[in-house]
């Protein structure tokens, strides 16, 4: 499988303002779509606060694989990267810079919303092509990790939600795409 990376074109965009690739055109079945359905877009912070944050959305464009099959076209996906503030920068005991806040809640840049995109997979040896829907990150956000509680407890960053919430990676490869995610594993 020497197909994993197509190109790695990481660009930094502001969450909520970035451009995402359009999914392929669908059958014209809009009469069933609920007018007010779906989830509202989440803007982790206002534009005026941007300088205080460094939650980044990195765009990676590459082919996807599922076993021996490869996507007919490359797919652009987001990876959430960077630290979140606002905070003071302080060196720690071994000289690395880290975010610090009084009483120590940490902030992490993790996926916020997801989208699905149809992907056509071409298989070698004359095997039939496959059609899959790949789940991709649509946007990133800052979530708060409270040190005084379970380390896995993530909270939405912002006053609108105080609920503990699990964060997770964007479905990092339950099937053949696992190898595709390897180079992204440490991004967030």
């Amino acid at each position: 499988q020497g197909w994993q990376a197509f190109r790695n074109d990481a660009t930094e965009v502001i969450p909520g303002l970035g451009e995402y690739p359009e999914p392929p055109p669908e059958n014209n079945q809009t009469m069933n779509r609920a007018e007010n359905g779906g989830r509202p877009p989440h803007h982790p912070y206002d534009a005026k606060d941007v300088s205080e944050y460094s939650c980044r959305e990195l765009h990676y464009t590459r082919f996807l694989t599922d076993g021996p099959c490869r996507s007919a076209k490359p797919v652009t996906e987001l990876v959430c990267s960077g630290q979140c503030g606002p905070a003071r920068l302080l060196p720690n005991a071994i000289g690395r810079v880290k975010w610090w806040r009084p009483n120590g809640p940490d902030f992490r840049c993790i996926p916020d919303r997801y989208r699905a995109q149809r992907v056509q997979l071409l298989c070698p040896g004359g095997a039939a092509p496959r059609s899959r829907k790949v789940r991709l990150v649509a946007s990133c956000k800052c979530k708060r990790l409270t040190r005084f509680h379970n380390q896995s407890e993530l909270k939405d960053f912002g006053p609108e939600t105080a609920r503990p919430q699990k964060g997770r990676k964007p479905r990092p490869g339950a099937r053949g795409a696992k190898a595709n995610q390897a180079e992204l594993e440490n991004a967030y």
């Epitope: 014209n28 079945q29 779509r33 779906g38 997801y114 496959r130 099937r175 995610q181």
Partner: antibody, heavy 121, light 109 residues
């Protein structure tokens, strides 16, 4: 592991509304695509509607347009399906179903235990 | 709205092979309908056997396989077991709108 627990059985009169809940545990509801399926006694499965992550919105089956509303309370990780103007033929077991972990999107992987709604005068 | 058709009932002998099919009123079923197959036993919720035409799940016995055959989605059971007696439903994706087939009652005897 995603688990879905639905509200208990309901008995309703014709013309009334019913609201069935589906509590998600083991995952965050906002990260899942929830669908609703019903099954009348002795009959087959019927898709009612659900969240479409491609379009980022909820899609309802044409048959239920204007009568069904699917909502989510992300603060409690609970999804709701409300069906109005009930008639006797709406007597059925109502299931919630959601997608699963994995890079590839797979719908209808986890199912609630079902909620029996009986419409009777 | 599309209509999805299945055989109402099929019978297979223990150890035998049977193929259930799933057709669409709109034409040939293709990989872009992402065919799903579900198994349902009396008094239980359905469970997914196959997604996206041929993709099995961790709980799907190896004797089940999915494919496309002659413009239909197909579920093949090779080496039927008594516990495979159940109702089987297919589901097709019409661009975000889903339609179930009427179900096939599979008897193993």
């Amino acid at each position: 592991e995603v688990q879905l627990v639905q509200s208990g059985a309901e008995v309703k009169k014709p013309g009334a509304s019913v609201k069935v809940s589906c509590k998600v545990s083991g995952y965050t509801l906002s990260e899942l695509s929830m669908h609703w399926v019903r099954q009348a006694p002795g009959k087959g499965l019927e898709w009612m509607g659900g969240f479409d992550p491609e379009g980022g919105e909820t899609i309802y089956a044409q048959k239920f347009q204007g009568r069904v509303t699917m909502t989510e309370d992300t603060s409690t990780d609970t999804a709701y399906m409300e069906l109005s103007s009930l008639r006797s033929e709406d007597t059925a077991v109502y299931y919630c179903a959601t997608d699963t972990e994995g890079y590839w999107e797979k719908f209808f992987q986890h199912w609630g235990q079902g909620t029996l709604v009986t419409v009777s005068s | 709205q599309a209509v999805v058709t299945q055989e109402p009932s099929l019978t297979v002998s223990p150890g035998g092979t049977v193929t259930l099919t799933c057709g669409s009123s709109t034409g040939a079923v293709t990989i872009d309908h992402y065919p799903y197959w579900f198994q349902q036993k009396p008094g239980q919720a359905p469970r997914t056997l196959i997604s996206d035409t041929d993709d099995k799940h961790s709980w799907t016995p190896a004797r089940f396989s999915g494919s496309l055959l002659g413009g239909k989605a197909a579920l093949t059971l090779s080496g039927a077991q008594p516990e495979d007696e159940a109702e089987y439903y297919c589901l097709l994706d019409y661009g975000g709108t889903f339609v179930f087939g009427g179900g096939t009652k599979l008897t193993v005897l």
